[in-house]
């Protein structure tokens, strides 16, 4: 005979669960489906990841997202995790928003990002609900910098980047400062491949770095080079 009262709690059907913290009166729920739509848009050494919530929330409101990163070396095809070498705009686990920016990506590397959706009962199943997106980083190569000439008060510096990338660059930014003086620096912008830094102190070492500026933002910066002006005993202009 049927019981005169309803049961105080019901067993969940297969594939449905109650989380340990769920009250017995709460309906049975299940893990969410994968994020519905994921895009990865590369901008220089950054990637913006955007996704839409799962179509099936599993009947729960407590959805969070985790982002993981894998990098692959194009020459060898070998891959490995890259959490240690990239920077996320916010901690990549337990995200409640549906976007994140990943920066400090390396030029000419292939990246695969995985976004996983989880809710309060995801830990009760072994399967995962995730979507992946891949992106290749095509940031400009760091400029190769040379000292072309120097005098007691000037340094003539030139640089190059591979010809196929030159059309993407609208200007170059040259940053320089006296060695040992980290409080002040000078910046010069130019469209060409060389610059003469004037009004420098004699017999002094300067730190010089060149960075390409592209439509997507900054290209990779060159090495920080140390160039030294001539001492007053040195003769006039000297080509190196």
């Amino acid at each position: 005979l049927p019981s005169p009262e309803g049961a105080t709690s019901c067993e969940c059907e297969e594939g449905f669960f109650r989380a340990p913290q769920d009250p017995a009166s709460m309906p049975c729920t299940r893990p969410p489906s994968a994020p519905h739509y994921l895009t990865a848009v590369g901008m220089g050494a950054k990637v913006e990841l955007r996704w839409t919530p799962p179509q099936d929330s599993g009947g729960r409101e407590d959805i969070v997202y985790s982002v993981t990163c894998e990098q692959c070396w194009p020459e060898s095809g070998e891959c490995g995790p890259c959490e240690a070498s990239v920077r996320y705009s916010e901690p990549p686990h337990g995200l409640t928003r549906t976007s994140v920016t990943v920066s400090d990506l390396e030029p000419h590397m292939n990246y695969t990002f995985t976004v996983e959706a989880r809710n309060g009962v995801s830990g009760l199943v072994t399967s995962r609900s995730f979507r992946t997106a891949s992106v290749s980083i095509n940031q400009t190569e760091p400029p190769k910098v040379r000292l072309e000439g120097r005098s007691t008060t000037s340094l003539s510096v030139s640089w190059s980047i591979p010809p196929p990338q030159q059309s993407r660059v609208w200007k170059y930014e040259v940053t320089y400062r006296k060695k040992g003086d980290s409080n002040s620096y000078n910046v010069r912008r130019t469209e060409g491949f060389s610059v003469t830094l004037d009004d420098l102190a004699p017999d002094t070492t300067y730190l010089v770095q060149v960075q390409a500026l592209t439509q997507e933002g900054q290209g990779a910066g060159s090495k920080v080079h140390e160039f030294q002006t001539l001492s007053p005993e040195g003769s006039g202009n000297l080509a190196v």
Epitope: L147, S182, A220, K223, H225, E226, F227, V240
Partner: antibody, heavy 127, light 108 residues
Framework: QVQLQQWGAGLLKPSETLSLTCAVY????????WSWIRQPPGKGLEWIGE???????NYNPSLKSRVTISVDTSKNQFSLKLSSVSAADTAVYYC?????????????????????WGQGTMATVSS | SYVLTQPPSVSVAPGQTARITCGGN??????VHWYQQKPGQAPVLVVY???DRPSGIPEQFSGSNSGNTATLTISRVEAGDEADYYC???????????FGGGTKLTVL
């Protein structure tokens, strides 16, 4: 081919001064910045400081108050003194030569790679 | 002060490729040098200026550096490559030389 030969007292008591010397054979002290580096047992490398032939020095900030590096160009030698030693200063101490001259035609190489190292001197501080 | 971060240990089977990383803020703008050190011996320079090899160092040692990570790659690893490996840079902001903490490479 340049060779580095180093020597100095191996056993010290706390608060004493560690003194080591490094002789450069087969080359001149000029044009290079010469370094001292140490390695405590089972640990990593730590740069102590550097000196050039004219006596200009640059020290690791964590040791600066206790370190003196000097040069004797007539003997082609440079030396390290570390005062007020404690057990934490127990280490193998190395002298080292950078790969390239410090500056050539206006292009300088601070913190260059070290291609030649002394044989190392174990200094133990114990009461 | 500038900090270089290396994994304490890396294990690899003979014949495989080992990758040892050296992390530091904007390390790509610095020249990175790598040393191999075997027990009881002074360090030996294996790669300088990110990717160049001194004479006498075999081709199996190579390096790369960009962004925040420099990498020493040892291809076709053999038992004789088992050692500690250190990265080194010059920090131009403080004018001081910095070593990474070292990575012990174990050949399985």
């Amino acid at each position: 081919q340049v060779q580095l030969q180093q020597w100095g007292a191996g056993l010290l008591k706390p608060s004493e001064t560690l003194s080591l010397t490094c002789a450069v054979y087969g080359g001149s002290l000029s044009d290079y910045h010469w370094s001292w580096i140490r390695q405590p047992p089972g640990k990593g490398l730590e740069w102590i400081g550097e000196i050039n032939h004219s006596g200009s020095t640059n020290y690791n900030p964590s040791l600066k108050s206790r370190v003196t590096i000097s040069v004797d160009t007539s003997k082609n030698q440079f030396s390290l003194k570390l005062s007020s030693v404690s057990a934490a200063d127990t280490a193998v101490y190395y002298c080292a030569k950078p790969f390239r001259p410090h500056c050539t035609n206006g292009v300088c190489h601070s913190g260059d790679a070290f291609d030649i190292w002394g044989q190392g001197t174990m200094a133990t501080v114990s009461s | 002060s500038y900090v270089l971060t290396q994994p304490p240990s890396v294990s690899v089977a003979p014949g495989q490729t080992a990758r040892i990383t050296c992390g530091g803020n904007n390390i790509g703008s610095k020249n990175v040098h790598w040393y191999q050190q075997k027990p009881g011996q002074a360090p030996v320079l294996v790669v300088y200026d990110d990717s160049d090899r001194p004479s006498g160092i075999p081709e199996q040692f190579s390096g790369s550096n960009s962004g925040n990570t420099a990498t020493l790659t040892i291809s076709r690893v053999e038992a004789g490559d088992e050692a500690d490996y250190y990265c080194q840079v010059w920090d131009s902001s403080s004018d001081h030389l910095v070593f990474g903490g070292g990575t012990k490479l174990t050949v399985l």
